[in-house]
Interface confidence: medium
Amino acid sequence: AVLTQKQKKQHSVLHLVPINATSKDDSDVTEVMWQPALRRGRGLQAQGYGVRIQDAGVYLLYSQVLFQDVTFTMGQVVSREGQGRQETLFRCIRSMPSHPDRAYNSCYSAGVFHLHQGDILSVIIPRARAKLNLSPHGTFLGFVKL
Amino acid sequence: AVLTQKQKKQHSVLHLVPINATSKDDSDVTEVMWQPALRRGRGLQAQGYGVRIQDAGVYLLYSQVLFQDVTFTMGQVVSREGQGRQETLFRCIRSMPSHPDRAYNSCYSAGVFHLHQGDILSVIIPRARAKLNLSPHGTFLGFVKL
Amino acid sequence: AVLTQKQKKQHSVLHLVPINATSKDDSDVTEVMWQPALRRGRGLQAQGYGVRIQDAGVYLLYSQVLFQDVTFTMGQVVSREGQGRQETLFRCIRSMPSHPDRAYNSCYSAGVFHLHQGDILSVIIPRARAKLNLSPHGTFLGFVKL
């Protein structure tokens, strides 16, 4: 649902769900490609594996990934790239059971950060070919402009 | 980053990251000392192991701690002390694997609470000498005035 | 605490804690009955096992459940029922240790969603007779109107 702003005082929001997840052959990471499920305001733009910040400011960011993987620890890193540098904002880490039938954990984290115009926000799983569940209610990413 | 308020309608926010963590000898707790990473508004003040509320109101509070400990369960308790009593607001609990290489879990929780002027907010890990990872993107504490 | 609104610009909020949790005999689910711990505004109404949305809009929803259960995976599903259909908004999943003394995990998740007038929000644990800890700082549910 894309909502129009009735008044300036409303918060811009963006809630994204996965399209797919891929690993580059030469990289020990898995990236998620996102699509909007809910958008209010125009300050944020989904762009493939990232989200572009068009309206600088202070945002509440949240991220959840649902893992189905027996790798001993799994998790995601939320980072921003802009002004020529990359910065990790927050990460979530979950120890996983070694038995495949039990290896099922969601990992949620969130925080408030100042984002700059032109920043690209992304969610990275620092594992090649990570086994994720891309259900929209298990894996998602969100922004609220404060 | 310390931000100035362009207009009164903006939310006061404070995002804190660790300086260090210590345990008192006579108590089975570990406390975290905090420093601001992002601040907007003046209603919240980091004070060593606590955060003083200078502007009463309803706040979204969030807390994450990154544990590297084989103690069977780990977690943090977020509480407020004020008006002569202490109150637990919320807690996060995580069972930990017994193998040190796997014992790596972040624990995130959050909620909305009414805080009073003069309240001191703190994050307690009810374990002495808890093994924490004090990376600013793994362990943090935050407030948003609603 | 029920707070009055000093001005229209304040966010409506509702933070709920458990009264009890029950399983219907013929159903493989456990439901939680909620009571308000903090309320500001009139747009949300606790109704037994659900929360009725009286004021449509975009909300930050959060949910935590504290599990004390050796069932291999535990978790909660937050869903809305309205306009003749049910929709899962988000879920939290946690693998549990098989030893009862270690089987202790909180599961937190949250997200931003558009809720319609008349929607009923509920938290379901898709396990019959799930062993939950109903401490108000371990299991809770919350809403912030954005």
Partner: antibody
């Protein structure tokens, strides 16, 4: 099977100290906290605190802070509770009790047989 | 400190009776309440934890219920071995506190 065996009865004078021991067997000593609870004659139960054998860290009831010391010796799976500056109203049966795990949110599932401490001049 | 108020203080009943003991907490303690049975000269024995979970080996005639501030221990059909003193305890907030006890005696 889990057993907690406490030391024998003690008679002490006011102002003295008493140290009660509690030997655990049948489980991994460092995986559970050990609570201490006392019961004055004909009265109810009063929680004094606990020792976490995993990290040798105590948690005391504020009422007893400064007078109580809880310790442990993991090599012999034994917990100790020492109460100083004894008064006549400290006359009670002192119990050790195993905490079911993480101290908060867990009940006390196994109890020692109790140690009678009598404070009399 | 949280006050746990038990009632009644004394209860007279007969074998086969159904009896109920209540415990009220001075503030919300979730379901972090235990019930113990104590016989004269003996240590307390855990019956119920988490308000309603029977400990292993405890007969099914013992049941617990409640959450928040009001809790109940019910013995569905009294047996001769059940005449004892019963204590509730909250373990939600330090310091842990006990009720003053209910003495169950033969009528």
């Amino acid at each position: 099977q889990v057993q907690l065996v406490q030391s024998g009865a003690e008679v002490k004078k006011p102002g003295a100290s008493v140290k009660v021991s509690c030997k655990a067997s049948g489980y991994t000593f460092t995986s559970y906290v050990m609570h201490w609870v006392r019961q004055a004659p004909g009265q109810g139960l009063e929680w004094m605190g606990y020792i976490n054998p995993y990290n040798d860290a105590p948690k005391y009831n504020e009422k007893f802070k400064g007078r109580v010391t809880m310790t442990r010796d993991t090599s012999i799976s034994t917990a100790y509770m020492e109460l100083s500056r004894l008064r006549s109203d400290d006359t009670a049966v002192y119990y050790c009790a195993r905490g079911l795990g993480y101290a908060l949110y867990y009940a006390m599932d196994y109890w020692g047989q109790g140690t009678t401490v009598t404070v009399s001049s | 400190d949280i006050v746990m108020t038990q009632s009644p203080s004394t209860l007279s009943a007969s074998v086969g009776d159904r009896v109920t003991i209540t415990c009220k907490a001075s503030q919300n303690v979730g379901n972090n309440v235990a019930w113990y049975q104590q016989k004269p000269g003996k240590a307390p024995k855990l019956l119920i934890s988490s308000a309603s979970n029977r400990d292993s080996g405890v007969p099914s005639r013992f049941s617990g219920s409640g959450s928040g501030t009001e809790f109940t221990l019910t013995i569905s059909s009294l047996q001769p071995d059940d005449f004892a003193t019963y204590f509730c305890q909250q373990y939600n907030i330090y310091p842990f506190t006990f009720g003053q006890g209910t003495k169950l005696e033969i009528k």
